[in-house]
Amino acid sequence: AITEAREEAKPYPLFPGPFPGSLQTDHTPLLSLPHASGYQPALMFSPTQPGRPHTGNVAIPQVTSVESKPLPPLAFKHTVGHIILSEHKGVKFNCSISVPNIYQDTTISWWKDGKELLGAHHAITQFYPDDEVTAIIASFSITSVQRSDNGSYICKMKINNEEIVSDPIYIEVQGLPHFTKQPESMNVTRNTAFNLTCQAVGPPEPVNIFWVQNSSRVNEQPEKSPSVLTVPGLTEMAVFSCEAHNDKGLTVSKGVQINIKAIPSPPTEVSIRNSTAHSILISWVPGFDGYSPFRNCSIQVKEADPLSNGSVMIFNTSALPHLYQIKQLQALANYSIGVSCMNEIGWSAVSPWILASTTEGAPSVAPLNVTVFLNESSDNVDIRWMKPPTKQQDGELVGYRISHVWQSAGISKELLEEVGQNGSRARISVQVHNATCTVRIAAVTRGGVGPFSDPVKIFIPAHGWVDYAPSSTPAPGNADPVLII
């Protein structure tokens, strides 16, 4: 028997006729045991369908009466087998059994899909005792059914270590289609086919699927769920959803955006984080990725000097962390810097170019042709040199640093002199006689001290010795510097 909840279900007596021993249906129960509080009556369905033999579990009592007549087999009476109703409606169903009074402590439990229903369910057991038997009615009600209430319900009773099981009552809760798989947002290549999947279930079945693209239904004919939509390709972004319908109504999935992969937008906000004489640290804000992950970026550097040859240096780097240190640059130079990034589709345009400058650096070469000679009459050492090439000064020359080390009889003493940038000679006082003086010179800019020249040694004799010829650094390509006497 199938009963639709929204049809007119009329309540009727729990028992269509008296129980053995003249129990009438209008008797009030002597004992009512609610399994949970808050019971509310709901739709009531016929608990009995007399007339056919019971097929469920039966307990045959071994006890006999004084006349030794065997008691009839114990079994639950037949009840409604299948209840169909809409979501959020109420339902009530029951099991009933007549138990000889010789049995004590009989309890009925409710089970759903093989699991006992414990806790706050609206279950009530009522007992109607008579001379020989007690009629027991176990009622189960659900005030607002949900899909999760779908299933097979049975009653169980334990008696004499025997278990009596009722026929199942199948509850089918019908409602709008329920999505088990909805389409997902995707980023796709232009004019390339892709699939979208939609699946919804009832009950009631069947569930049919219509696909919607940009508010227009794609298919005139529905497809039975599950449905796979093959889109042959798109040239522009589209929004897809699916509509599932069954005999209860329509449910619409979330709308998903299908984006077309494109080349990225150029990076923005390229900025200078730090400058040194030979490197510039830049950062940038990536542009829109074109719906495809960035793979790498390219930093383009060109000299801003109008007299330069206009060649572009290219430095490739990973897309993260949007930071790159450009190296091997000249000091005190102006550069134009642009950034471009790529994804699987291609390279972005170059960002707006920015101007950046390297700072002054320490000179990269030492002064040339350093010569040293002793002026014994004034007890001085004269030093001469040539200033380094302008290009390699890496900044504006502010002077020179002279290191002179005096060594004699195990004693060593280094002194440093700073001289101005004008001129290319210096005079230092003899510090120790009968000693070797080692001289090195470095050019100095605001960027720092450059490398020292190769050492030039001169021997300072004791008083009264003859003058010596000057010592000098060799010309490029010559042998090591030597003391010239």
Epitope: R6, P204, E205, P206, N208, F210, V212, S215, R217, E220, Q221, P222, K224, S241, E243, H245, N246, D247, G249, L250, V252
Partner: antibody, heavy 114, light 109 residues
Framework: QVQLKESGPGLVAPSQSLSITCTVS????????ISWVRQPPGKGLEWLGV???????DYNSALKSRLTISKDTSKNQVFLKMNSLQTDDTARYYC????????WGTGTTVTVSS | QAVVTQESALTTSPGETVTLTCRSS?????????ANWVQEKPDHLFTGLIG???SRAPGIPARFSGSLIGDKAALTITGAQTEDEAIYFC?????????FGGGTKLTVL
């Protein structure tokens, strides 16, 4: 392409019954619910009832006692039967796809007259 | 039974945007009313335009769009054309039955 085509008697005597057939092509009735709609001359549309994919029905409550909708899925046909016709049942009768009223038959004119 | 109300007539010009509305006597129109819009042209030609979740039927031009505006269902024709002159019926679903509105006669002058 989904197409619906109604066929009916044209003229029905008062108090007699009306039977109309809607033949569906391009789709199976096991996946398409069909509604019946009528339009009296010079008036608006009135929904009569629906037959669901599973064979269940719902009717316009004002006409429920006189209406029966059924179908033969194997022949892809839906049937409308209406009893006790009166002159105000004169109308053009249409079958249409249900949840989206987007596929309509061309309709069949029924005149109730003696 | 619910009563569904539409404007009896509207006039627009080609290229203009016009909105037809559909009100329910039971309260605000919601998505569960599955508002449908049906166009009737001479010789009993009915075409469903919008249905379900405000989606256009296959082949219906994008100038037709359905929506819920306030407590009413609405059909908007963006850039009306002379061939859009017709009667437009709205239908609302109430749990187990459709109710049609009286129809709006749209004139495109």
């Amino acid at each position: 392409q989904v197409q619906l085509k109604e066929s009916g008697p044209g003229l029905v005597a008062p108090s007699q019954s009306l039977s109309i057939t809607c033949t569906v092509s391009g789709i199976s009735l096991s996946s398409f619910a069909i509604s019946w709609v009528r339009q009296p001359p010079g008036k608006g549309l009135e929904w009569l009832g629906v037959i669901w994919t599973g064979g269940g029905t719902d009717y316009n409550s004002a006409l429920k006692s006189r209406l029966t909708i059924s179908k033969d899925t194997s022949k892809n046909q839906v049937f409308l039967k209406m009893n006790s016709l009166q002159t105000d049942d004169t109308a053009r009768y249409y079958c249409a796809s249900h949840w989206y009223l987007d596929v309509w038959g061309t309709g069949t004119t029924v005149t109730v007259s003696s | 039974q619910a009563v569904v109300t539409q404007e009896s007539a509207l006039t627009t010009s080609p290229g203009e945007t016009v909105t037809l509305t559909c009100r329910s006597s039971t309260g605000a129109v919601s998505t569960s009313n599955y508002a449908n819009w049906v166009q009737e042209k001479p010789d009993h030609l009915f075409t469903g335009l919008i249905g379900g979740a405000n989606s256009r039927a296959p082949g219906i031009p994008a100038r037709f769009s359905g929506s819920l505006i306030g407590d009413k269902a609405a059909l908007t024709i963006t850039g009306a054309q002379t061939e859009d002159e017709a009667i437009y019926f709205c239908a609302l679903w109430f749990s187990n039955h459709w109710v049609f509105g009286g129809g709006t006669k749209l004139t495109v002058l």
